[in-house]
């Protein structure tokens, strides 16, 4: 650690005195201190001498000696008071700039330590400090305003009591800057704009920040627009607004508009697209297939996307049949706006009943005309099966009718014993009917098929079962011949709760 001669923490001299401060270290040493004039600095081997032969109040301050080559960065310091009866203060700065909530040191150094008891801090022209100003004083460093606030940005003077009267320092301007968290906040409205040629349009670009030092501009396809700026201050934020008003838009006004704001922390930008069209438009589309198949009892949401300008004048969902003249309940229709020109309309169909299959149409209208989008809803049903014994062309035949959607496949099983359902161990024979006869196949209805199994002789200790299945489920009917005739066993009743 360097050593300073004289080896005292502080030195008090009179104006005009010669002051010599010597610093000695192991290696080269250097002096540093307030940038006060009239010092001469010279080196002498491993020592550095700071001297003046005419000390003034401006030389009051703390002088520090460091050894640049010392890895531990040791230093020594001495504080010099130049005790001028006419000048109680040496002010080291015209202005002090800090960020909010930092301590602000106002560097009025007392030139005479004896005066410490009578010091105070005031605002210029003798005005008292603002309420809640918390400050402390050090004769070596000056007044510290603790946790400075933006509102404390004022001009201050240091006051000392000399011979019963207050002597003021020159003023120090305190600038407390807001802490800027990042680039200015931006809004660009609207987020998207569509106009018909000849209509009026407005685009507003606004930026705000806690600090007034920021720039904002609006550009169209990379060309900066010259727009008058409106400035405002509210909610403790500075706001700058650029408003582009277009009385009659044309195709050259279309394109990308960017709102750009920047400050010392960086740049923010946001963009929007302006479309200019020749006439009104209305487009309907769906991400869903327009042909829908749903299992009976389940629910379905039909969704239509609408792109339109100008806005819709009317819209509704309509059931076009074929089962009844009921119309969808309005409470099941829902509209959500994705953005200004795109909307999604949803029709919720919960727990679908057989009578609700059919065509659903969404109709919408704007000045561009009417448009419709129609969905076809077919319900899926598990097969229902029945078997009867009959004679066809003199031959004994088992006739199986299966009804469901999609069209059921039919399989016949013959098994030993009397049973409601053949299991694998009992099966004697299996016949698949690849082409059952289609009895009915109307849109939105079940498909009914019929399969015939010609049986020359019914075996009385056996069961004949007709099984039908489709993608929804399966159904079966067991036929048990008995001596007195035939006996049929339908499966457990098919429970249906719509």
């Amino acid at each position: 650690i360097p050593v300073i001669e004289p080896s005292v923490p502080e030195l008090v001299v009179k104006p005009g005195a010669t002051v010599t401060l010597r610093c000695v270290g192991n290696g080269s040493v250097e002096w540093d201190g307030p940038p006060s004039p009239h010092w001469t600095l010279y080196s002498d081997g491993s020592s550095s001498i700071l001297s003046t032969n005419n000390a003034t109040f401006q030389n009051t301050g703390t002088y520090r000696c460091t050894e640049p080559g010392d890895p531990l960065g040791g230093s020594a310091a001495i504080h010099l008071y130049v005790k001028d009866p006419a000048r109680p203060w040496n002010v080291l700065a015209q202005e002090v700039v800090v960020f909010e909530d930092q301590d602000a040191l106002l560097p009025c150094l007392l030139t005479d330590p004896v005066l410490e008891a009578g010091v105070s801090l005031v605002r210029v022209r003798g005005r008292p400090l603002m309420r809640h100003t918390n400050y402390s004083f050090s004769p070596w460093h000056g007044f510290t305003i603790h946790r400075a606030k933006f509102i404390q940005s004022q001009d201050y003077q240091c006051s000392a009591l000399m011979g019963g009267r207050k002597v003021m320092s020159i003023s120090i301007r305190l600038k407390v800057q807001k802490v800027i968290p990042g680039p200015p906040a931006l809004t660009l409205v609207p987020a998207e704009l569509v106009r018909i040629r000849g209509e009026a349009a407005q685009i507003v670009c606004s930026a705000s920040s806690v600090d007034v030092n920021f720039d904002v501009f609006l550009q169209h396809n990379n060309t900066k627009l010259a727009i008058p700026q409106q400035s405002d201050f509210h909610n403790n934020r500075y706001q700058k607004v650029l408003t582009l008003n277009l009385d009659q838009v044309d195709f050259q006004h279309a394109g990308n508009y960017s709102c750009v704001a920047s400050n010392v922390q960086g740049k923010h930008s946001t963009s929007m697209f302006f479309r200019v069209v020749e006439s009104a438009y209305l487009n309907l589309s769906s991400e869903q297939n327009l042909i829908q198949e749903v299992t009976v009892g389940e629910g379905l949401n039909l969704k239509v996307m609408v792109e339109a300008y100008p806005g819709l004048q009317g819209f509704n969902w309509t059931y076009l049949g074929p089962f009844s003249d009921h119309q969808p309940e309005p409470k099941l229709a829902n509209a959500t706006t994705k953005d200004t020109y795109r909307h999604t309309f949803t029709l919720s169909l919960p727990r679908l009943k057989p009578s609700e299959a059919g065509r659903y149409s969404f109709l919408a209208r704007n000045p561009g005309g009417w448009r419709a989008l129609t969905f076809e809803l077919t319900l899926r049903y598990p097969p229902e099966v029945s078997v009867i014994w009959t004679f066809i062309n003199g031959s004994g035949t088992l006739l199986c009718a299966a009804s469901g959607y999609p069209q059921p496949n039919v399989t016949w099983l013959q098994c030993s014993g009397h049973t409601d359902r053949c299991d694998e161990a009992q099966v004697l024979q299996v016949w698949d009917d690849p082409y059952p006869e289609v009895l009915s196949q109307e849109p939105f209805h079940k498909v009914t098929v019929q399969s015939l199994l010609t049986v020359e002789t019914l075996e009385h200790n056996q069961t004949y079962e007709c099984r039908a299945h489709n993608s929804v489920g399966s159904g079966s009917w067991a036929f048990i011949p008995i001596s007195a005739g035939a006996h049929t066993h339908p499966p457990d009743e098919f429970l249906f709760t719509p």
Epitope: E30, W31, P35, P37, H38, W39, L92, A93, V96
Partner: antibody, heavy 117, light 110 residues
Framework: QVQPQESGPGLVKPSETLSLTCTVS????????WSWIRQPAGTGLEWIGR???????NYNSSLKSRVTMSVDTSKNQFSLKLSSVTAADTAVYYC???????????WGQGTLVTVSS | QSVLTQPPSASGTPGQRVTISCSGS????????VNWYQQLPGTAPKLLIY???QRPSGVPDRFSGSKSGTSGSLAISGLKSEDEADYYC???????????FGGGTKLTVL
Amino acid sequence: QVQPQESGPGLVKPSETLSLTCTVSGGSISGYYWSWIRQPAGTGLEWIGRIYTSGSTNYNSSLKSRVTMSVDTSKNQFSLKLSSVTAADTAVYYCARERMATIFDYWGQGTLVTVSS
Amino acid sequence: QSVLTQPPSASGTPGQRVTISCSGSSSNIGSNTVNWYQQLPGTAPKLLIYSNNQRPSGVPDRFSGSKSGTSGSLAISGLKSEDEADYYCAAWDDSLNGVVFGGGTKLTVL
């Protein structure tokens, strides 16, 4: 070795604010005075002002109304703002450490700022 | 117009001694010390002489400074081609309460 480094936009429009930052590597900025000095092309040096790490500033009287300096010790950097710039503010701007008044012992390499529309 | 006055140019041949003057007033050089800076082409200025006549470590002893009244001077002996640069003087000015520079002297080594 202490090494100051200036950064900021190279082009500023007339009437706007010039903002530069000086980041110091190789040593702490604390406890020292730091100055901004500029040099218009082909001419001499002009002292703009200085800032101490506590935020105390002294400015060249001819520029005082347009200059603000601030310091951020946590980032080991200080900054210069010069408002209402004109073409006459076009120059290479240097930041430097200042000792004992006018002894500028460490300089940045300088950054050219052009004021033009 | 600089507060401190320097000749715009100076020249010398290798090995020669050249002197650059810096003239001020009582409010600057008359009451404060003079510092000198060397600026090689395309680079930042570098401290050459401080406190009238002190050389920072690394500066050759061919460079020396002096002050008399309200003027300062920089002498370069044994001139070398690498000394070709701009040289600036600087001092504190009590009236302006700030640092003032000379206009600079362009030294050419012939």
